[in-house]
């Protein structure tokens, strides 16, 4: 098909040679008035943001991507020729960086429903360059972590060395959807939840005397929990004495809260102290009874078939430990009166 009628957009991807990073192209089809296809389920021309990813309708995921070879050969279907480029609905994902990704990419609807739809296409001229700016040694990573439950921020890698005052207006997308309120080079998150994770794209416009182009960077954001700085605490038993009936069976439960650790090796065990002797008791396996993002509660029971006079002289000690330290709670049995 004739691509001379396609709207054109220039993009720059400056990649870091130090890290793995991805890139995306959105199928930003032209404004609604250009064709029936583009009109469908779109906002009115006044409402359409400058770069609106092509989302939101069943039709809209049905686009075809091509690359235009530089030697003038016919257009190539992306899916057939480029294994490192993946099409996901209206988005083209580049899985590996490299100057060989430079070129012209064209997208258009698969279904041409009217003669007007032929011109409903967009040509993206992508220039890919390795980052050479040595002055910005600490530019933001393309993989950023947010600590769950705390305040955090997501920085646009291509602008992270600029102050907020110098920074141009930035257009942000999250998982392909425009974040219309965000315009600065940093998104501040007051309290981080799991839904803040995802693929973020930041765009800003650069221009010289001849032309202007969009500088784009992609940030993969993960939400993580920080390792605990606390040793485990014992929630139960609380009291250090327990009233019991002689001759009856008894179960004493030890419930301990362990803070999150990426490498999690919790220890929870019972041992008995009798005068100068102490020994570990083989008791049923520990089991997790509650799990949250920040902690896990583990229970382990000691079971006495029947309480004897000797047991009243002993101390039953629950011992819990993580990588930070340990805690103990001892229980002395006391005969119930009456």
């Amino acid at each position: 098909f004739n691509i001379s009628g396609c709207s054109t957009k220039k993009l720059l991807w400056t990649y870091s040679t130090r890290s793995e990073e991805e890139f995306v192209l959105f199928c930003d089809l032209p404004e609604p008035q250009k064709s029936h296809f583009c009109h469908r389920n779109r906002l009115s021309p006044k409402q359409v943001p400058e770069h609106l990813p092509f989302m939101g309708s069943n039709d809209l995921s049905d686009v075809q991507w091509y690359q235009q070879p530089s030697n003038g050969d016919p257009l190539e279907d992306i899916r057939k020729s480029y294994p490192h480029i993946i099409q996901d609905k209206c988005t083209l994902h580049f899985l590996t960086p490299g100057v060989n990704n430079s070129g012209s990419y064209i997208c258009r609807p698969k279904m041409i429903k009217s003669p007007y739809d032929v011109a409903c296409c967009v040509k993206m001229i992508l220039e890919v360059k390795p980052q050479t700016n040595a002055s910005c040694e600490y530019s933001a990573s393309h993989k950023q972590d947010l600590l769950l439950g705390s305040t955090g921020s997501i920085s646009c890698p291509s602008l992270s060395c600029q102050s907020d005052a110098q920074s141009p207006a930035v257009t942000w997308y999250k998982n392909g959807k425009l974040l219309s309120v965000e315009r600065s080079n940093r998104i501040v998150v007051d309290e981080v939840y799991d839904y803040h994770q995802g693929t973020y794209v930041c765009d800003y416009t650069q221009s010289d005397t001849v032309s202007s182009w969009t500088v784009r960077a992609v940030v993969q954001v993960r939400t993580i929990v920080g390792d605990t700085k606390l040793k485990p605490d014992i929630l139960d038993p609380v009291e250090d004495t327990l009233e019991v009936e002689l001759g009856k069976p008894l179960t004493i439960s030890c419930k301990a809260r362990f803070g999150f650790e990426r490498v999690f090796n919790p220890v929870i065990k019972w041992y008995i102290k009798d005068s100068d002797l102490e020994w570990e008791v083989s008791v049923p396996e520990a089991k997790s009874i509650k799990s949250t993002l920040k902690d896990e509660i583990i229970e382990r029971n000691i079971i006495l078939e029947k309480v004897t006079q000797r047991d009243l002289r002993r101390k039953f000690v629950c011992f819990v430990q993580n990588s930070i330290g340990n805690t103990t709670q001892s229980v002395q049995l006391k005969e119930k009166r009456g």
């Epitope: 799991d194 009874i289 799990s291 993002l293 229970e299």
Partner: antibody, heavy 115, light 111 residues
Framework: SVEESGGRLVTPGTPLTLTCTVS????????MGWVRQAPGKGLEYIGY?????TPYYASWVNGRFTISKTSTTVDLKITSPTTEDTATYFC?????????????WGPGTLVTVSS | AAVLTQTPSPVSAAVGGTVSISCQSS????????LSWFQQKPGQPPKLLIY???TLASGVPSRFKGSGSGTQFTLTISDVQCDDAATYYC???????????FGGGTEVVVK
Amino acid sequence: SVEESGGRLVTPGTPLTLTCTVSGFSLSSAAMGWVRQAPGKGLEYIGYISTSGTPYYASWVNGRFTISKTSTTVDLKITSPTTEDTATYFCARDSYAGDYAFNLWGPGTLVTVSS
Amino acid sequence: AAVLTQTPSPVSAAVGGTVSISCQSSKSVYNNNWLSWFQQKPGQPPKLLIYGASTLASGVPSRFKGSGSGTQFTLTISDVQCDDAATYYCLGSYISSSDNAFGGGTEVVVK
């Protein structure tokens, strides 16, 4: 988003698996719970599955249900349904990856157990 | 298992007025504050209003207020609107998740 599927009419004793499909977030950082509601009755807590994949059940469950998950789905298996299990079953996400602040719910799927 | 007892239904409220619903737990909830409140309208899934006993969930009007600690909790709706007509449930979470349970629900009728 969260959406349940698999609800249908089954005869007593026929195992049934309900599936909750999630999108837009990862099950590695969100706990998912199952809640049911018999026609005209209140909500009943069944259990949840933690970010690490460990299931936790309400004490009344006693092996009647099994919760498991893959990377994008959470399953609830009703091992041997009885007529008392007739209800709308909801799947819900706890953003705080706990087991009580369910802030995203599916529309529910109806299970009818009848002979 | 824990038992959560809510204010009996139905509770009547006038538009612009205030209504309070109580939720009493048979044992202390985890951290003394792991209790949430939900609103449910017929044919819809529940909607989270309050978690952590008093923290307002995202997008919930500040007319909804949760209070209480340990075993006794209250949901207060001030400046009641017609749209607040619904059934409200509390959900308690405990040291052992096997004790987790909903209250029986309280229907709020707006006049």
